[in-house]
Every structure is written in structure tokens, then in C-alpha cells.
Amino acid sequence: PPNRRTCVFFEAPGVRGSTKTLGELLDTGTELPRAIRCLYSRCCFGIWNLTQDRAQVEMQGCRDSDEPGCESLHCDPSPRAHPSPGSTLFTCSCGTDFCNANYSHLPPPGSPGTPGSQGPQAAPGESIWMAL
């Protein structure tokens, strides 16, 4: 790879547990998306909260390591947790610059892979993302 991985960086107000330390923020000014150059991986992530057919971005940034899913060229979110009734967290990992800027599509919350009644589930390395 010729360049270090660069991802979109965003953390919604009220989100606990910052991933800012997983990269170096680029000075992009105010009108552009914030960008972060990953320190420990070549992998971006994104987390969206889907509530009543409305998706809201919760976090975007660098992952702390390269793990399964990071080889994806695009952000294809999968359902990960139910932080509250009627809402579902979708996360993606991908391995191209700014691939976490937006998602290709969101599967319906009830699709296979959605955690059931056992409550929130976090894939390895995702625990920091779940502290919302």
C-alpha cells in the first residue's frame, strides 16, 4: 500500500469512548468531512443507529486493528446491537480511503444476523463502539 489509511472521523454528541486516539486528525477546515489517518490499522469503521427507518451516524473512524471485514472495499453494515427498543446499531468495517463516509445499504433490522433477546453483542475489537 502506498499510503496510510485515511478514514472519515465523526463522533456524535454524547457518545462515550472516543476513537480519536486510533489516528491523527487531518486539518481539513470546517466545510469538509473530518479525516483521520489511522495509526494501528488500515481499516475504517462506521456505526449508524437506525430508528423508524431513519439512519443517524453515531461514529466513524479508524479501527484499532485489521480484522475480518477490513478487506471490504465498501461499507456494508450489518446489525450489531439494540441499544434501545425500536433502534438498531449497524456497523461496517472496510479497507479503502474514506470508505466509511456512507454505507451502500442498510439491511432491515430484523434480517439474519440481528442479535436476538440476548442483548447487545460486540464483535472483537468493537467494545469501545458499543458504549453509546
Epitope: P1, P2, N3, T6, L32, P33, A35, Y40, D97, A101
Partner: antibody
């Protein structure tokens, strides 16, 4: 095939500005960083900065921050670099490059009173 | 800034003989993601630079296999197994691990 074609040579007086272009073809322009590098007469190479055409995010060598603006026109797959407050030591050949794998032919900028 | 120091600065070589260029960085070029962002470029007289090697040892497409790169940390080497007439020019190492990215001062290869 991948090509980067740069604009023509420029002669400027100290204090002036110069804006040069770099037209890309043969690949998806928005998928690769465009870097700018300069080479002063008889000297080595110096990295100026880079821009990601898809979203306009750029990253600069601190030495040039405040004097350089990098922009793109996605509709024509063209990158631009503007250098302001020119000094005689800005006399150099300026290259654009697609993530350093393909390079333009260079623009000679001469700054002289 | 990370200083890239090349040696020798001038390299006279006989056609068909091997050549070796050394590049030392003032800081380790191994990044936190496990990659080392070290590249080698060739600049023939009157031409734009051309990438030969990226990631220390990966040959760029179209680059003859007589060119090879090696090294780690702060010490890197570009080797040409058998020098040909078209190899004449200036060779630069380059690091993209630290901002600002920096080039070595160049090694001029000429035919003896």
C-alpha cells in the same frame, strides 16, 4: 492507460501567485490521492501536499501551509495547485502525481524580477 | 522532519555489474499498522520520476526484476543486479510514514 497532463511553463515576479493544472485520464479520478511534488534546479524532490478528489480533503507539508491551495474539478478530472506569495526560491519544476505511481510531465515555474 | 540520507551520492558502475544504493532514515519507518512506507524512484535525465519500489520491496508494475529493495526500520537498500545503459539517472528513496513525507537527496548512477 493512466496519464497526467500538466499545464505549461510559467514566469512570475516575486509576490505573485501561480495556479497550475493537472488533467487525469485512464482511471477513476476520485479514487486516488493526487500529490504535488517540486524539484528545484539541481536539487532533489520536495513533497508539497496531497488532495483526495472525492471529498476535497487535503494534507500539506507544514512548510507550504498557508501559501498553497489544492483543489479539484471532478467534472473534468483535473487537479489544481495554487502557490501564492512567490519567492525566487520557489523556482522549480512542479509535478502532480497519482499517489506517486504515475507522474505528470512537470511545470517549470520561474520566479524572477 | 524525517531526514533520508542516501549513499553514495555518485555511483559509477560498469555495464552488466551490480549496483547498490543505501538509504537511512532519521526515524524508524515502520508504522503502527505494521507497514513500512518506503519507496524508491528513478529519474532519468530530462524525465519525470518513476516509481520502482513501494513498501520496501514490492516492485511496481513494469519494473524489471533486476531491481530489488530490502531493509527495515531505518536502513534500506536498492539493488540493481546487472546495470543496463537505460538505468542511468538519479535514484531517490522516499518515506510516507511520517508527515511531511520526505525524499532522500538522490544518488546519481552513471556508466563507467
Amino acid at each position: 492507460q493512466v496519464q497526467l497532463v500538466q499545464s505549461g511553463a510559467e514566469v512570475k515576479v516575486p509576490g505573485a501567485s501561480v495556479k497550475m493544472s493537472c488533467k487525469a485520464s485512464g482511471y477513476t479520478f476520485t479514487d486516488y490521492w493526487v500529490s504535488w511534488v517540486r524539484q528545484s534546479p539541481g536539487q532533489g524532490l520536495e513533497w508539497i501536499g496531497e488532495i483526495y478528489p472525492k471529498n476535497g480533503v487535503s494534507n500539506f507539508n507544514e512548510k507550504f501551509k498557508g501559501r498553497v491551495t489544492l483543489t479539484v474539478d471532478k467534472s473534468t478530472s483535473t487537479a489544481y495547485m495554487e502557490l501564492r506569495s512567490l519567492r525566487s526560491d520557489d523556482t522549480a519544476v512542479y509535478y502532480c502525481t497519482r499517489q506517486r505511481d504515475y507522474w505528470g510531465q512537470g511545470v517549470l515555474v520561474t520566479v524572477s524580477s | 522532519d524525517v531526514v533520508m540520507t542516501q549513499s553514495p551520492l555518485s555511483l559509477p558502475v560498469t555495464l552488466g555489474q551490480p549496483a547498490s544504493i543505501s538509504c537511512r532514515s532519521s526515524q524508524s519507518l515502520e508504522y503502527g499498522d505494521g507497514y513500512t512506507y518506503l519507496e524508491w524512484f528513478q529519474q532519468r535525465p530530462g524525465q519525470s520520476p518513476r516509481r520502482l519500489i513501494y513498501g520496501v520491496s514490492n516492485r511496481f508494475s513494469g519494473v524489471p526484476d533486476r531491481f530489488s529493495g530490502s531493509g527495515s526500520g531505518t536502513d534500506f537498500t536498492l539493488k540493481i543486479s546487472r546495470v543496463e545503459a537505460e538505468d542511468v539517472g538519479v535514484y531517490y528513496c522516499f518515506q510516507a510514514t511520517h508527515d511531511p513525507n520526505t525524499f532522500g537527496q538522490g544518488t546519481k548512477l552513471e556508466i563507467k
